[in-house]
Interface confidence: medium
């Protein structure tokens, strides 16, 4: 889970060990943040839990880019 | 393309364990999200438990909370699901079901697993 | 928990006839962000695993004869065999997957008359 040590930066310390379903996901944002330890990717899904994930692994990526064509996609 | 493989039936004691294997192949076990569902004699279908990638753990049903554990092998790629202090209410198929990346729902099941629990 | 509720636990129809299954879930299982119902049917033959029908309440799994249809959205969700085949007898069940734990319907038994 992300962690706010002195809001407003939210750092990860951990990534998810695993891939999650990217019909869960509902958003993410970047966490480049220089205070933090590493960059990171903090999902947030449809059930409001937030996951630190590695901007490095594919299916991160693949995640992100499935995301933001649905934002792009104007709802009918 | 997923599959499973499930281990064979099994008959046991009340008051014992059993403990039954889904072999993955097509996929690793890290890349799905392995399940346990069972289903009783002309019963439904009862949802045992499984891993949760958003919480990033096993989580169970709570009818089944410190009789159950369920446990993955990632060597082999085989999931494991332990029940003890067994009744005869336990009788039941048990199945392995998974999900693939794109999809949140169950989408591959094996055959099952019958497990009798008799005296 | 999310508890679903299907009717009738069973049904008679003639072959060609039309059948309905009606699930019903205690909570919404639409996220409304993406317009999406997180439920799923599937058709289960003795001795068999369940097969999944149809996905996001109303998307056909590919395979699946054009006869099945899901329908619905929120709480409320039909599924319809326009016209009802021997194959078609089975049980059938309704689960949802927006948020553990994962839940079925008691499930439905489809019969020939």
């Known amino acids: 889970q992300p962690d706010a040590i002195n809001a407003p930066v939210t750092c990860c310390y951990n990534f998810t060990n695993r891939k999650i379903s990217v019909q869960r996901l509902a958003s993410y944002r970047r966490i480049t943040s220089s205070k933090c330890p590493k960059e990171a990717v903090i999902f947030k899904t449809i059930v409001a839990k937030e996951i630190c994930a590695d901007p490095k692994q594919k299916w991160v990526q693949d995640s992100m880019d499935h995301l933001d064509k649905q934002t792009q996609t104007p709802k009918t | 393309q997923v599959q499973l493989v499930q281990s064979g039936a099994e008959v046991k004691k009340p008051g014992a364990s059993v403990k039954v294997s889904c072999k993955v192949s097509?996929?690793?076990?890290?890349?799905?999200?392995m399940h346990w569902v069972r289903q009783a004699p002309g019963k439904g279908l009862e949802w045992m438990g499984g891993?949760?990638?958003?919480?990033?753990?096993?989580i169970y049903a709570q009818k089944f909370q410190g009789r159950v554990t369920m446990t993955e092998d990632t060597s082999t790629d085989t999931a494991y699901m332990e029940l003890s202090s067994l009744r005869s209410e336990d009788t039941a198929v048990y199945f392995c079901?998974?999900?693939?990346?794109?999809?949140?729902?169950?989408?591959?099941w094996d055959q099952g697993t019958l497990v009798t629990v008799s005296s | 928990d999310i508890v679903m509720t299907q009717s009738p636990d069973s049904l008679a129809a003639s072959l060609g006839e039309r059948a309905t299954i009606n699930c019903k879930s205690s909570q919404s299982v639409l996220y409304r962000s993406n317009n999406k119902n997180y439920l799923v049917w599937y058709q289960q033959k003795p001795g068999q695993p369940p097969k999944l029908l149809i996905y996001?309440?109303?998307i056909r799994e590919s395979g699946v004869p054009d006869r099945f249809s899901g329908s619905g959205s929120g709480t409320d969700f039909t599924l319809t065999i326009s016209s009802l085949q021997a194959e078609d007898v089975a049980v059938y069940f309704c689960?949802?997957?927006?948020?553990?734990?994962?839940?079925f319907g008691q499930g439905t038994k489809v019969e020939i008359k």
């Open positions: 689960q949802q997957y927006y948020s553990s734990p994962w839940t």
């Open positions: 079901a998974t999900n693939d990346f794109w999809s949140g729902y169950f989408d591959c």
């Open positions: 996001w309440a109303s």
């Open positions: 097509g996929y690793t076990l890290t890349e799905l999200s």
């Open positions: 891993f949760d990638p958003e919480d990033d753990e096993t």
